[in-house]
């Protein structure tokens, strides 16, 4: 691959939908504009399910209506997803550029495996 | 002598802690007694969750106080493990032992990792 | 002004070796992964070898075409790279072009492999 | 190994139109697909890297798009200068293959 980048292999969404985990790369330069794409890649199928641009040391910044939120420290980038249903299981890929100065980079992940139960629902309260 | 075990790499558990999976084996002689142990791998500690002996064509039995039941076809067990929390997360191993008529056999499958999600507590109904 | 300057081409026989050598200015050098890419008439561009940075503790990597026979190398010290090719063959005729992560190159060395 | 199927590979084009040149890879390559212009006597120039990204010095009129196996480079507006061969390149794993070039030539 290009540019290394890590993610953990598994990760458990929690009974609200919620999944969180960890992009790390290894930055051959001095980057100080880095871009972040989440993948989801299901029955070969791939769509892209978020994407961040962020200066080195600031806050990444979603769209206002994206499912995903970050923060970024280092080389690491701790993304979190929410609104996950049970049918949105799937492989989560990481893809990182650094964009900004040259050298351009890119790398992706081997992709974190994300589980998504969905909660019974509660009785009714009468 | 040694046989052919074959289970999911990975189940999840339901919102109510109840996980099902198949353990199929490959008998190679024509056993009408049979033998299947739940064991589960967690920080290389090995511990039984249930076992359960059973005549070809009936019923599994496991012990009353059992977490643990299943049934039989053919050379499927269907096994379905409930009471799961998320502290019970690890690898479930199957081991199946064709115990009579001789000779004896014994296999084991590489195991299926069972998630489990903790339910979030419902809102209190005042 | 990047500039990228290959030296070492030239006329050589059939399993003889050839070093070829690229010196690079206008940019810093020890952040990119320096590269030899090939140009022929039969095989258009064919990349040959990279050698990572630092970073990456200089991992080098090859072409199945090369594997064995070329190793590249670098010296950040001096910004340059160079291309160590033993046992030429026909096939690896062409000129030879220094890249600096693809983004730069060089204006290439003409390597012509004959008896 | 990745393979770079490219098309056409040769096409010719009146001054002022658009025109397009793709490329199919083996396999997804999430975007890691650099384009690069080569003059006739000249070394390649970078065009466009990450598949949609316009390098330095190089006119708008060239734009990159695609993405998993399918990317394409279109030339807007086209100049004589734009007279060259264009290869496209997997820059995702090595081996870093290229594309067999199209060239392009005005009527």
């Known amino acids: 691959k290009a540019m290394h980048v890590a993610q953990p292999a598994v990760v458990l969404a929690n009974s609200r939908g919620i999944a969180s985990f960890v992009c790390e790369y290894a930055s051959p330069g001095k980057a100080t504009e880095v871009r972040v794409t989440v993948l989801r890649q299901a029955d070969s199928q791939v769509t892209e399910v978020c994407a961040a641009t962020y200066m080195m040391g600031n806050e990444l910044t979603f769209l206002d209506d994206s499912i995903c939120t970050g923060t970024s420290s280092g080389n690491q980038v701790n993304l979190t997803i929410q609104g996950l249903r049970a049918m949105d299981t799937g492989l989560y890929i990481c893809k990182v550029e650094l964009m900004y100065p040259p050298p351009y980079y890119m790398g992706i992940g081997n992709g974190t495996q994300i589980y998504v139960i969905d909660p019974e629902p509660c009785p009714d309260s009468d | 002598k040694a046989m052919h075990v074959a289970q999911p790499a990975v189940v999840l558990a339901n919102s109510r802690g109840i996980a099902s999976f198949v353990c199929e084996y490959a008998s190679p002689g024509k056993a009408t007694e049979v033998r299947v142990t739940v064991l589960r791998q967690a920080d290389s500690q090995v511990t039984e969750v249930c076992a359960a002996t059973y005549m070809m064509g009936n019923e599994l039995t496991f012990l009353d106080d059992s977490i643990c039941t299943g049934t039989s076809s053919g050379n499927q067990v269907n096994l379905t493990i409930q009471g799961l929390r998320a502290m019970d997360t690890g690898l479930y191993i199957c081991k199946v032992e064709l115990m009579y008529p001789p000779p004896y056999y014994m296999g084991i499958g590489n195991g299926t990792q069972i998630y489990v999600i903790d339910p979030e507590p419902c809102p209190d109904s005042d | 002004e990047v500039k990228l300057d290959e030296t070492g081409g030239g006329l050589v026989q059939p399993g003889r070796p050839m070093k070829l050598s690229c010196v690079a200015s206008g940019f810093t050098f020890s952040d990119y992964w320096m590269n030899w890419v090939r140009q022929s008439p039969e095989k258009g561009l064919e990349w040959v070898a990279q050698i990572r940075n630092k970073p990456y503790n200089y991992e080098t990597h090859y072409s199945d075409s090369v594997k064995g026979r070329f190793t590249i190398s670098r010296d950040d010290s001096k910004s340059s790279v160079y291309l160590q090719m033993n046992n030429l063959r026909g096939e690896d005729m062409g000129i030879y072009y220094c890249t600096g992560t693809f983004a730069y190159w060089g204006q290439g060395t003409l390597v012509t492999v004959s008896a | 190994d990745i393979q770079m199927t490219q098309s056409p590979t040769s096409l010719s084009a009146s001054v002022g139109e658009t025109v397009t040149i793709t490329c199919g890879t083996s396999?997804?390559?999430?975007?890691?697909l650099n384009w690069y212009q080569r003059k006739q006597g000249k070394s390649p120039q970078l065009l466009i890297y990450?598949?949609?990204n316009l390098a330095d010095g190089m006119s708008s009129r060239f734009s990159g798009s695609g993405s998993g196996r399918q990317y394409s480079l279109k030339i807007s507006s086209l100049h004589p200068d734009d007279v060259a061969t264009y290869y496209c390149?997997?820059?995702?794993?090595?081996?870093?293959?290229f594309g067999g070039g199209t060239k392009l030539e005005i009527k």
């Open positions: 396999e997804n390559i999430y975007g890691g």
């Open positions: 990450g598949a949609t």
């Open positions: 390149q997997n820059v995702l794993s090595t081996p870093y293959t």
